[in-house]
Amino acid sequence: SGTTNTVAAYNLTWKSTNFKTILEWEPKPVNQVYTVQISTKSGDWKSKCFYTTDTECDLTDEIVKDVKQTYLARVFSYPAGNVESTGSAGEPLYENSPEFTPYLETNLGQPTIQSFEQVGTKVNVTVEDERTLVRRNNTFLSLRDVFGKDLIYTLYYWKSSSSGKKTAKTNTNEFLIDVDKGENYCFSVQAVIPSRTVNRKSTDSPVECMGQEKGEFREI
């Protein structure tokens, strides 16, 4: 129960990519405002996004403190202009979010091919090590820093003249593949965390092809 005309939030949903984490909910407020609280399972509640008319709250700063923890959030509903008012039980109306473990659940962002270099019949393809908002010793960590060997990349590569996609995998950010001399190849990469059961794959990087400026060709 709650104050007249105040409705509880619903459809609380975590939206998270490379640890940038936003809690979303419904409904759009009519004569009410929201405040969000977040906590680890064993920790204290911390309030965020005070008395907002938004239906989202950026909780990145909280979850990056320990991405392996499991977090719970709750969204409180208050009557607009009367935020001290509480429900009939003396508590404001609120709804709990699903639990969220960033390390296991954040979506992997679209990777980017940083460069490729051909030397004879070998091509070295390098994937950009994307920066996250996770910090250690006041510096932002890369995706590789956070996930270590849990993160692999799958490279799809194909001759410009054909459609079949060969694959290679690496647990670094570099591939060294064999190619046919005189052929142009295209490349796309996908980040994967095989130890997960859901959200295992990123979307594919933009396709890069030999003969474009990103690559370098050296004849040996």
């Epitope: 799809y156 996609k165 994967v192 095989p194 059961t197």
Partner: antibody, heavy 120, light 107 residues
């Protein structure tokens, strides 16, 4: 529990077509890769091709290239093998299999197989 | 394509015997080799991955090793349920390729 169930096998004449289905349960196919592997009677295992259902990327063995097509319906959590211009040498048990997708583990689960016989 | 040459093609052994099957890759495949067991009328089952790692639920009498491009599957003490056909497979490059198989029969 992870399960892969193939169906659609049967007797077909040379030059004919057949579509095999691979219904997956216990996991979401877009999170993995699906392979088709075949085994002619009394022979060894031969890799046919794969699909990444997440992006639709495929690759085929030379022996089936241009004749076979792998696809997936993610809403049904099912992969397919469309076989055209079938030849006697395509007679085999066809297995679909799940690729775990790591550097170390490759195929970790297989279906029970479905028999395709190409004969006049 | 990488060729996986498996030997022997068949062998006869008794319960309790130590059995060794080898596979040679035609070029470097790092440790990207798996071993599968297949019984008549059944699908293959994963035994060993990454050349030497025992897959979950597989008895510890099975082991795998690598020396350069040579890969070995060893059954330390053959059990009645181990009579089957064994295949190696490389997944280092596309297309992945299988060895021809080794049939382990009762002596």
């Amino acid at each position: 529990e992870v399960q892969l169930v193939e169906s659609g096998g049967g007797l077909v004449q040379p030059g004919g077509s057949l579509r095999l289905s691979c219904a997956a349960s216990g996991f979401t196919i877009t999170d993995y890769w699906i392979h088709w592997v075949r085994q002619a009677p009394g022979k060894g295992l031969e890799w046919v091709g794969y699909i990444d259902p997440y992006n639709g990327y495929t690759y085929y063995a030379d022996s089936v290239k241009g004749r076979f097509t792998i696809s997936a319906d993610t809403s049904k959590n099912t992969a397919y093998l469309q076989m055209n211009s079938l030849r006697a040498e395509d007679t085999a048990v066809y297995y679909c299999a799940r690729d775990y997708g790591s550097l170390q583990v490759f195929i970790d689960y297989w279906g029970q197989g479905t028999l395709v016989t190409v004969s006049s | 394509d990488i060729q996986m040459t498996q030997s022997p093609s068949s062998l006869s052994a008794s319960v309790g015997d130590r059995v060794t099957i080898t596979c040679r890759a035609s070029q470097d495949v790092n440790t990207a080799v798996a071993w599968y067991q297949q019984k008549p009328g059944k699908a293959p089952k994963l035994l060993i991955y990454s050349a030497s790692f025992l897959y979950s639920g597989v008895p510890s009498r099975f082991s795998g090793s690598r020396s350069g491009t040579d890969f070995t599957l060893t059954i330390s003490s053959l059990q009645p349920e181990d009579f089957a056909t064994y295949y190696c497979q490389q997944h280092y490059t596309t297309p992945p390729t299988f060895g021809q198989g080794t049939k382990v029969e009762i002596k």
